[in-house]
């Protein structure tokens, strides 16, 4: 017997779609061998219709595909726009059609239910609105108009022009009779329920002269859209529920084992704590559509998700919904990177951010997740150089190490910096990732003076003390600008043997400015790194003043409050201050503060994805 398994019989109706899932033992050979769907002919030969190698027969062109899911030993054949000609005997299998592992599937496509002649079919999703059209002759214009529902052999009155409304349809049905000359009346039913499904009869007048029209109303719960995303990646649910509910509260919920739906996030401010720091609900557009982004996908995020609208912000029968079935692929293309990075107050962190290596030219961004209301993510820094003003001198985005990873360094840490941050690009949105920064007890490893005042024309020497554990690291000084940190010549003080022995007095790297000029004013970072991987940094501000006869002045830069021109990531990226809403894939008009300077500088912290190992990565 073949170890391949699937449905023995599949039945559907014309115009419908089927999704046939075949299961196979997920051995390494099976996972990577050819998968196929073929039709058995009279001769016994099985003619390939679609295969995992990209082949699609002309009969299936534009309406079928085969997707392999090697990690769980399944492949799925989707066939749309079924016709009765598709009825027949098929095989789903692995390897070669004539020999190899396969399973027999019988597909039967029928015409659909037998309906009275002239029946109009209305196919509508649950929660939506249907308008049933009922024509009549002139002589029945003044007479009673009515809509009945056929239940078995009886007809139950639903609504009529004498103001009767069946209690099951209360507050969601209306009968419209147009002005003179128009020989059609309409019945509009809102917020359709599954129980509204069935055969209806429009009637105008009575007796043998009455006008009748049959309507078959098919109320469907929306077929879940299958969504496959990578572990650690990101998913976006786009939800369009229609103008009728544009001003009603929206939600995303996940169906649980009891077949009820737990709210994940809604526009009333509710959010499931399991998604803290990694979810945003994008403010809706005028048409009522909205989207929800979830990053840092976990295996336990798998399941059926529904978005919907209801004043309570949760699922209620008879309100519109959209559905998805999310699968999280554990054989992820997105590399592991720490989900938690720890730093000490006054110290620094370096965050490694993955991006799609095929998109090395994409713009890179880092934003701070804010949980208020539906969540938002104001951009703090971007690869083109813009840095939020309140982060000046302490935040930098570096292209290194490259090849699918960039680095973000944040120093002068305070407890206010604790929180969730998102790494993203204007390219592949599935590569958005989340990292949490935690501020822990401890002292910074690098010690620099407090803010320094230099005298114009004189020499300034700034020491940076480092502990023995950094003796093998490369030490550097750089001048910070909003486009990075330009490396400067610096010197290790003391002979090399002193470092080998780690002499207490020799752990010093100094920056000398000689002579000091006006252009030297600004932020300087002392840092350590190993190749393209950055360790800790410490920042010092150098103020430059004229030579004074006596006394000295201590200069401290004024830190700006929130930047007025703030960019925010929703599920797209928005600029505040009446700027255009922008999709993160486009960024047509970036606001850039012109500045130059090579990017260098960085920091390393102890990291925790579950352990507290240092953050790693692969160099170019």
């Amino acid at each position: 017997k073949s170890p391949v398994f699937g449905p023995q019989e599949v039945s559907s109706v014309e115009g419908n779609s089927v999704s046939i899932k075949c299961y196979y033992p997920p051995t390494s050979v099976n996972r990577h061998t050819r998968k196929y769907w073929c039709r058995k002919g009279a001769s016994g030969r099985c003619i390939t219709l679609v295969s995992s190698e990209g082949y699609v027969s002309s009969n299936y062109a534009g309406r079928a595909n085969l997707t392999n899911f090697p990690e769980n030993g399944t492949f799925v054949v989707n066939i749309a726009q079924l016709s009765r000609d598709d009825s027949g005997h098929y095989k789903c299998g692995l390897g070669i059609n004539s020999r190899g592992l396969s399973f027999d599937v019988s597909l039967e496509v029928s015409q659909g239910p037998e309906l009275p002649n002239g029946t109009e079919v209305y196919t509508v999703d649950v929660g939506r609105t249907v308008t049933i059209k009922c024509p009549f002759k002139t002589e029945n214009a003044p007479k009673t108009k009515a809509l009945y529902k056929k239940i078995g052999q009886t007809s139950v009155l639903v609504i009529d022009s004498r103001n009767y409304v069946n209690p099951n349809y209360k507050d969601r049905i209306r009968l419209r009779i147009p002005g003179t000359g128009q020989l059609i009346f309409t019945v509009v039913i809102d917020r359709l329920r599954l129980s509204d499904h069935g055969l209806y009869l429009c009637q105008a007048g009575d007796g043998s002269n009455r006008d009748e029209k049959n309507a078959d109303l098919q109320v469907l719960e929306p077929e879940p859209e299958l969504v496959y995303e990578d572990l650690r990646g990101s998913v976006t649910f786009h939800c369009a529920l229609g103008l009728e509910v544009a001003n009603v509260a929206k939600f995303l919920c996940r169906v649980n084992s009891r077949e009820t739906c737990d709210v994940v996030i809604n526009t009333l401010g509710k959010r499931d704590s399991a998604f803290e720091g990694r979810i945003l609900l994008n403010p809706q557009d005028k048409d009522g559509s909205f989207s929800v982004v979830i990053t840092g996908l976990r295996k336990e995020d798998e399941g059926r998700y529904l978005c919907g609208a209801h004043s309570d912000g949760q699922l209620q029968e008879g309100w519109p919904i959209q559905a998805w079935q999310l699968f999280v692929n554990e054989e992820s293309t997105i590399p592991r990177s720490p989900t938690v990075v720890k730093g000490v107050a006054g110290g620094s962190v370096a965050v490694l951010c993955p991006y799609n290596p095929k998109e090395s030219q994409s713009l890179k961004y880092w934003c701070l997740w804010e949980g208020a209301q539906n969540g938002r993510c104001p951009l703090l820094v971007e690869s083109q150089g813009l840095v939020q003003e309140q982060y000046e001198g302490r935040l930098s985005l570096l292209q290194e190490p490259g090849n699918g990873t960039f680095t973000v360094i944040l120093n002068q840490l305070t407890t206010q910096d604790a929180g969730f941050y998102w790494c993203l690009t204007n390219g592949d949105t599935r590569w958005r990732t989340t990292v949490e920064i935690k501020i822990i007890e401890g002292e910074p490893n690098l010690k620099v003076p407090g803010n320094v005042t230099a005298v114009l024309g004189e020499t300034l020497n700034i020491p940076c003390h480092f502990p023995c554990k950094f003796s093998s690291y490369e030490k550097y000084w750089c001048k910070w600008s909003n486009t990075g940190c330009q490396t400067l010549p610096s010197q290790d003080e003391g002979p090399s043997e002193a470092f080998v022995n780690c002499d207490e007095n020799s752990r010093l790297v100094s920056l000398t400015l000689n002579p000091v000029t006006r252009a030297d004013e600004g932020w300087y970072w002392c840092g350590v790194k190993q190749g393209h991987f950055y360790g800790e940094t410490a920042a010092v501000y150098v103020a430059v003043e004229e030579k004074k006869v006596a006394g000295s002045r201590y200069v401290s830069p004024a830190k700006a409050d929130a930047a007025p021109d703030e960019k925010v990531l929703d599920s797209g990226v928005r600029e505040i201050e009446n700027k255009a809403i922008q999709d993160p894939r486009l960024f047509a008009e970036e606001k850039v503060v012109a500045d130059t300077g090579d990017q260098a500088g960085g920091s390393r912290a102890s990291v925790d994805s579950s352990s507290s190992e240092e953050q790693g990565g692969s160099s170019k």
Epitope: F5, P7, Q8, E9, V10, S11, S12, V13, N16, S17, V18, I20, Y23, G112, L194, H197, Q218, L220, E221, E223, P224, V255, S257, R258, E259, T260, R304, A323, Q325
Partner: nanobody, 129 residues
């Protein structure tokens, strides 16, 4: 909460037929799966897959059968009654077992009992030789 109630079990001779019913009550989403499993005497707690039915929107059905019952058993559903049936023909003594009805996720492997969320109490089927 979904409740499942089985009926139709009994004693039958080899080669005879039985029709099991499983009535579901409570809220279920329309894309759903229901299956039949059986537990042979002395085989507790093992439940073997017999047949399953997945449906979406009352118009598309997928029927799955264990090799041991292919061609003899037929699974079907009555939409209006929210009931799933298992028609068992040409019964053999090895079909003797407690038959359980289960309800579960439309997307899971229909053969895996752990994938089903709801279970009925079971109905005894005895095939005498």
């Amino acid at each position: 909460e979904v409740q499942l109630v089985e009926s139709g079990g009994g004693l039958v001779q080899t080669g005879g037929s039985l029709r099991l019913s499983c009535a579901a009550s409570g809220r279920t989403f329309s894309s759903y799966a229901m299956g039949w499993f059986r537990q042979a005497p002395g085989k507790e707690p093992e439940r073997d897959f017999v047949a399953a039915l997945r449906w979406s929107n009352d118009r598309t059905y997928y029927k799955y059968y264990a090799d041991s019952v292919k061609g003899r058993f037929t699974i079907s559903r009555d939409n209006a009654k929210n009931t799933v049936y298992l028609q068992m023909n040409t019964l053999k003594p090895e079909d003797t077992a407690v038959y359980y009805c289960a309800g579960g996720n439309y997307f899971s492997d229909p053969r895996v009992d752990k994938e089903y969320n709801y279970w009925g109490q079971g109905t005894q089927v005895t095939v005498s030789s």
